[in-house]
């Protein structure tokens, strides 16, 4: 987790002088509780947005937006703590909005936004906005939390972000797999424009099961420049096992930008349809 660039982040708006500060996620009001605290945020919304760094790289960011409740507690609102928690790693990053002037009611509901938390493809987050100061130990909570799921690099908008392109998202191998006679599979795919090797991983399964009955790995050497974007054809020999008929072919590239961690593409060949077995004819004809 990180913030997009380190340029000056602003939270000021007409009628409010505000500054964005780094936060330890442990606001002072936890340690020194106040008697009067503001109510919780209203209508917290998290959306996937995309933003360029000063270097021109494109990153997915969490766009956080919320409004204030129209009650008198607005008079005691000194700011907000924004926290993003990556659910799997338990890594948390916080920033603090510090209000440098008192809020006053005006004709429109106060609305705040922040779009500088960089998020990772295919990751899950919990976003929390805490109004400051935080409540006394037994006080009503004054925060709101929402979960946020970032799509993976297959997602159209994600595909062109810097982290996805670094893992090979622009390569479309257009895999085709056909079953040949004599227990063979012909795998065909389009090579990318990089002189790097590939690996084909074949896993076979029985018709209705998820336990593999055959596994095979095939190495494809790095293509020459004249072979870039051309089709590569490979014939794989299957083990002659009855019922081991569902085949998953996975192609793993080793691009220089992602090495062992590049996006893999796969295709599956289903078992052939079994013809419906005819009803057995009874040995005798019933009389009714």
């Amino acid at each position: 987790l990180r913030l997009l660039d380190h340029r000056a982040l602003v939270c000021s708006q007409p009628g409010l002088n505000c500054t964005v500060k780094n936060s330890t996620c442990l606001d002072d009001s936890w340690i020194h509780p106040r008697n009067l605290t503001p109510s919780s945020p209203k209508d917290l919304q998290i959306q996937l947005h995309f933003a360029h760094t000063q270097q021109g790289d494109l990153f997915p960011v969490a766009h956080i937006e919320w409004t204030l409740q129209t009650d008198a507690s607005i008079l005691y609102l000194e700011g907000a703590e924004l926290s993003v928690l990556q659910l799997n790693t338990n890594e948390r990053l916080c920033v603090r909005f510090e209000f440098l002037s008192k809020l006053r009611h005006h004709h429109r509901r106060w609305r705040f936004t922040f779009s500088h938390f960089v998020v990772d493809p295919d990751q899950e987050y919990e976003v929390t906005v805490h109004h400051l100061p935080k409540p006394i130990p037994d006080g009503d909570p004054n925060h709101q939390s929402k979960n946020f799921l970032v799509p993976d690099c297959e997602h159209a908008r994600m595909k062109v972000t810097t982290p996805c392109m670094s893992s090979g998202s622009l390569w479309d191998p257009n895999i085709t797999v056909e079953t040949l006679e004599a227990h063979q599979l012909r795998v065909s795919f389009t090579l990318w424009n990089e002189s790097t090797h590939y690996q084909i991983l074949l896993t076979s399964f029985p018709h209705m099961e998820n336990h593999s009955c055959f596994e095979h790995m095939h190495h494809i050497p790095a293509p020459r420049p004249e072979e870039f974007h051309q089709r590569s054809n490979v014939t794989l020999t299957l083990r002659n096992l009855k019922g081991c008929c569902r085949h998953q072919v996975q192609i793993q590239p080793f691009f220089s930008s992602c090495l062992n961690d590049c996006l893999r593409h796969s295709a599956t060949v289903s078992c052939p349809e079994m013809p419906d077995t005819p009803e057995p004819i009874p040995d005798y004809m019933p009389l009714w």
Epitope: L87, T89, N90, E124, S145, K146
Partner: antibody, heavy 116, light 107 residues
Framework: QVQLVQSGAEVKKPGASVKVSCKAS????????ISWVRQAPGQGLEWMGW????????KYAQKFQGRVTMTTDTSTSTAYMELRSLRSDDTAVYYC?????????WGQGTLVTVSS | EIVMTQSPATLSVSPGERATLSCRAS??????LAWYQQKPGQAPRLLIY???TRATGIPARFSDNGSGTEFTLTISSLQSEDFAVYFC?????????FGGGTKVEIK
Amino acid sequence: QVQLVQSGAEVKKPGASVKVSCKASGYTLTSYGISWVRQAPGQGLEWMGWISAYSGNTKYAQKFQGRVTMTTDTSTSTAYMELRSLRSDDTAVYYCARRQLALDYWGQGTLVTVSS
Amino acid sequence: EIVMTQSPATLSVSPGERATLSCRASQSISSNLAWYQQKPGQAPRLLIYGASTRATGIPARFSDNGSGTEFTLTISSLQSEDFAVYFCQQYDTWPLTFGGGTKVEIK
């Protein structure tokens, strides 16, 4: 091929405990969380909680708080869910699933029958 | 907690026809909705998340429309393998909650 393979069916007496295992393969266990969901016979799905194998962090549904413990063993790529003080209404198929929000791969399920 | 309500409980459709399944949340969940398919004796399978993103390997005939509180799963042309029970699930806030399911059966 991502796979989650669960332990076999269990029959337990009321008041006993059950521990269901879920072995992950085809990916690194620490890359994603593991959620547990149960389904009573003929009923819908009920979320029980999740564990992060990376951090050990857990989140349990309030209904199961104090009665459920989720753990992982990264050396064997296995997640465990233990439910204590079993009652007859805990009879259900218990599923493990990958991830914490939208659950993309599921185990085959483990039927736990609680009967005296 | 957020209550998810699915309708109808059972939907009878002929193969090749369009099926429309409804899911309503008791409060706004933005686009934080997933759809699952479950066949008898099998575990659920993720179809759609983010209210509109198809999971890996899910055919284009499955699509979702909606955000906020009203969502619709559409199966444009039912195939024989699509007859199953479908569940919606919100992941906007804890606890995660599921709808009661819609059974799609052959007419």
